[in-house]
Interface confidence: low
């Protein structure tokens, strides 16, 4: 879009005559009609394709035309066009005589034409005026002309539209060549795209104004780079939204089941070694000198009957001391100075010579033991308690102290694992020899029926435009993570496109 400007400077009609040769009465009250059109090798009649303009009466016969542009007048004459300037043109300037005040074509006498000039040629857009003078037999017209671009139009052909704006359709000013120059914080072809907070995640974050970072569903954090785990997730993390990936030692749908009681609770005391043996279940292996489920009980060192051959044990601060009976010596009274001749075997034990009488061995009757049959048999030495139960001598009998989850004389029976209702989501529990088994209802799986399997809200591919679908397990619904340029619960709506500009 631009304007062809024509500045009329001087018109000479010394004899004051019309084109027909007839004189004007009393003089030629002259006005001009201008026709601007496309280039024609021979300027011929037809539409003034680039526009027409008429002047008022500017003078009589011969006169100079004042430059009225400063006063808002009509010289230079303006012929606006709203297309790409082609660089060539045809121009027709007619001088007419107006006998009265009505300058409309149909109101003029048929022979009111004074003169007509027609020129054609090339004309580039620019600020400089081209001066021209056309002379006919009776008249002379001096004028100048140029083509300039309208406001907001740029380029060699005034074809580049650029109007600064700061609204929904763009945020820019115009460079001298008509190219857009985005305002700070904006980018894109039409400067419509805000530049988000530095570091804002490309897919998971977006912004509607500069230096902002708004998170898409399922994401959080200043830069929208932290996923939101499943609602209720206790000891777990996520790599995509609504996940609950359990930390080590935790299990279950919400990672709230403790699979590493040893690490999380350190139940074993006095330096014992802890072994996990199931959910909230563990075994402590005690260091010498300690006993109890959690090795919390300190044993007297003499409780293990370290003194042999009837030696008596005395606890000391730094350990114990064996007082040996006659005929025996050594740390544990293990060395004998006796032979069968000394009747060393007690409780009816039979003595057998060894090493040519230098040594002996006692064969003990039932229920007695020891190198001299001096000890009643400890019913716990055969470790009769199953499943890690602790054996305790109680006078003539023995008893087993069972670990949690076991019962029976020898801790051989499982307390029903099912008593705790371990099966989630209505699963049916079955006790087995070495644990339990859950039979899960439709839609659930896993050792404890903790995994949902039936309802996958994403199975039907509800998200459009290549969005990522996430199943929200807490509500059996889906969430669509839209790619850039789309919005809506299913990413079905494109964000508003820039308007089509004419270039």
């Amino acid at each position: 879009s631009g304007v062809f400007q024509l500045q009329l400077q001087e018109f000479i009609n010394e004899r004051g005559v019309l084109a027909s040769g007839r004189p004007c009465e009393p003089g030629c009250r002259t006005f001009f009609r201008v026709c601007l059109k496309h280039f024609q090798a021979v300027v011929s009649p037809g539409p003034c394709t680039f526009g027409t303009v008429s002047t008022p009466v500017l003078g009589t016969n011969s006169f100079a035309v004042r430059d009225d542009s400063s006063g808002g007048g009509r010289n230079p004459l303006q012929l606006p066009f709203n297309f790409t300037w082609p660089g060539t043109f045809s121009l027709i300037i007619e001088a007419w005589h107006a006998p009265g005040d009505d300058l409309r074509p149909e109101a003029l006498p048929p022979d009111a034409l004074i003169s007509k000039i027609a020129i054609q040629g090339s004309l580039a857009v620019g600020q400089n005026w081209l001066l021209d003078e056309q002379t006919s037999t009776l008249t002379r017209l001096r004028y100048s002309y140029r083509v300039i671009c309208s406001d907001n139009y740029y380029g060699d052909n005034c074809s580049r539209l650029c109007k600064k704006r700061n609204d929904h359709f763009g945020h820019y000013v115009c460079q001298p060549d008509g190219n857009l120059s985005c305002l700070p914080g904006w980018t894109g072809e039409y400067c419509q795209q805000p530049i988000c907070l530095s570091g804002c995640h490309e897919q998971n974050g977006y912004c509607s104004k500069p230096a902002e970072c708004l998170c898409r569903p399922g994401w959080q954090g200043r830069l929208c780079n932290e996923c939101i785990p499943h609602n209720g997730c206790r000891h777990g993390t996520c790599s995509t939204p609504w996940q609950c990936t359990c930390d080590e030692g935790w299990g279950g749908l919400f990672c709230d089941q403790d699979l590493n009681y040893c690490t999380h609770h350190s139940p074993c005391k006095n330096g014992a070694t802890c072994s996990n043996s199931g959910q909230r279940s563990y075994t402590c292996t005690c260091r010498p000198g300690y006993t109890g489920v959690d090795c919390e009980l300190e044993l007297s060192e003499c409780d293990s009957n370290p003194c042999r051959n009837g030696g008596s044990c005395k606890d000391q601060e730094d350990g114990y001391h064996c007082l040996c009976p006659p005929g025996y010596y050594g740390l544990h009274c293990e060395h004998s100075t006796l032979s069968c001749a000394d009747s060393p075997c007690f409780n009816g034990g039979s003595c057998r010579e060894r090493n040519q009488g230098a040594n002996y061995a006692c064969e003990c009757p039932p229920n007695f033991t020891g190198s001299n049959c001096e000890k009643k048999v400890d019913r716990c030495t055969s470790n009769p308690c199953a499943n890690g139960g602790q054996c305790l001598n109680r006078g003539p009998s023995r008893m087993c102290r069972c670990r949690p989850g076991f019962t029976g004389t020898y801790c051989e029976l499982h307390v029903s694992d099912c008593a705790r209702n371990p099966c989630a989501h209505g699963g049916t529990c079955h006790d087995l020899e070495n644990g339990l088994m859950c039979t899960c209802p439709a839609g659930f799986s896993g050792r404890r029926c903790e995994v949902r399997t039936s309802i996958d809200a994403c199975a039907s591919s509800p998200c459009f435009n290549r969005a990522t679908c996430y199943t929200d397990l807490s509500t059996d619904t889906f969430v669509c993570n839209c790619p850039y340029g789309f919005v809506g619960s299913r990413c079905e709506f494109p964000v508003g496109l820039p308007p089509s500009f004419p270039w």
Partner: antibody, heavy 119, light 108 residues
Framework: QVQLVQSGAEVKKPGASVKVSCKAS????????ISWVRQAPGQGLEWMGW????????DYAQNFQARVTMTTDTSTTTAYMELRSLRSDDTAVYYC????????????WGQGTLVTVSS | EIVLTQSPGTLSLSPGERATLSCRAS???????LAWYQQQPGQAPRLLIY???SRATGIPDRFSGSGSGTDFTLTISRLEPEDFAVYYC?????????FGQGTKVEIK
């Protein structure tokens, strides 16, 4: 007043030519142009072309380009339209009309010339 | 070529009624270059409106024109007996200059 008077009706055989005249009066002939328009029986108006009386430049509609010639004679202020190789579908009333250089509507019109093409 | 389509083809009205005639162009026409003509039976056309809305000399003010772009309208506010005729629109902005096919206004 401004007036255009056309020549009388013509009957022609297919393949012949016809030349219709249009005599102008009441205005300076050379500062305007003449357009030619035809109207077949019961039909609408069809523009054929124009000629400038100022410099004899002419522009013809595509349909008639090969068969029509328009001329003017400023000494008699008369415009002419010649149509060659006549066919039966050229049967029509042919009108001349004045148009201004800047303002291209047609005013006034001649009274029309009926050309009948028949074997 | 710009095609002008006039509607309706025929308009049956009584004297004193208002007539609205439409002319639609196949592409945009500058309003500077649209005219309306009236043709009585057996007569040459007569210029009514030029420049889409300017009345020609001697045309009564019951005739008015309006429109721009591709849609133009000729309105006769109160029909007189002499207004029953065929009306043509014409564009003279793009060569070839073309006419609409005409609207006949007849007495009901």
């Amino acid at each position: 007043q401004v007036q255009l008077v056309q020549s009388g009706a013509e009957v022609k055989k297919p393949g012949a030519s016809v030349k219709v005249s249009c005599k102008a009066s009441g205005y300076t002939f050379s500062t305007y142009g003449i357009s030619w328009v035809r109207q077949a029986p019961g039909q609408g108006l069809e523009w054929m072309g124009w000629i400038s009386a100022y410099d004899n430049n002419a522009d013809y509609a595509q349909n008639f380009q090969a068969r029509v010639t328009m001329t003017t004679d400023t000494s008699t202020t008369t415009a002419y339209m010649e149509l060659r190789s006549l066919r039966s579908d050229d049967t029509a009333v042919y009108y001349c009309a004045r148009y201004s250089w800047n303002f291209h509507w047609f005013d006034p019109w001649g009274q029309g010339t009926l050309v009948t093409v028949s074997s | 070529e710009i095609v002008l389509t006039q509607s309706p083809g025929t308009l049956s009205l009584s004297p004193g009624e208002r007539a609205t005639l439409s002319c639609r162009a196949s592409q945009s026409v500058s309003s500077t270059y649209l005219a309306w003509y009236q043709q009585q039976p057996g007569q040459a056309p007569r210029l009514l409106i030029y420049g889409a809305s300017s009345r020609a000399t001697g045309i009564p003010d019951r005739f008015s024109g309006s429109g721009s772009g591709t849609d133009f309208t000729l309105t006769i506010s109160r029909l007189e007996p002499e207004d029953f005729a065929v009306y043509y629109c014409q564009q003279y902005g793009n060569s070839p200059w073309t006419f609409g096919q005409g609207t006949k206004v007849e007495i009901k």
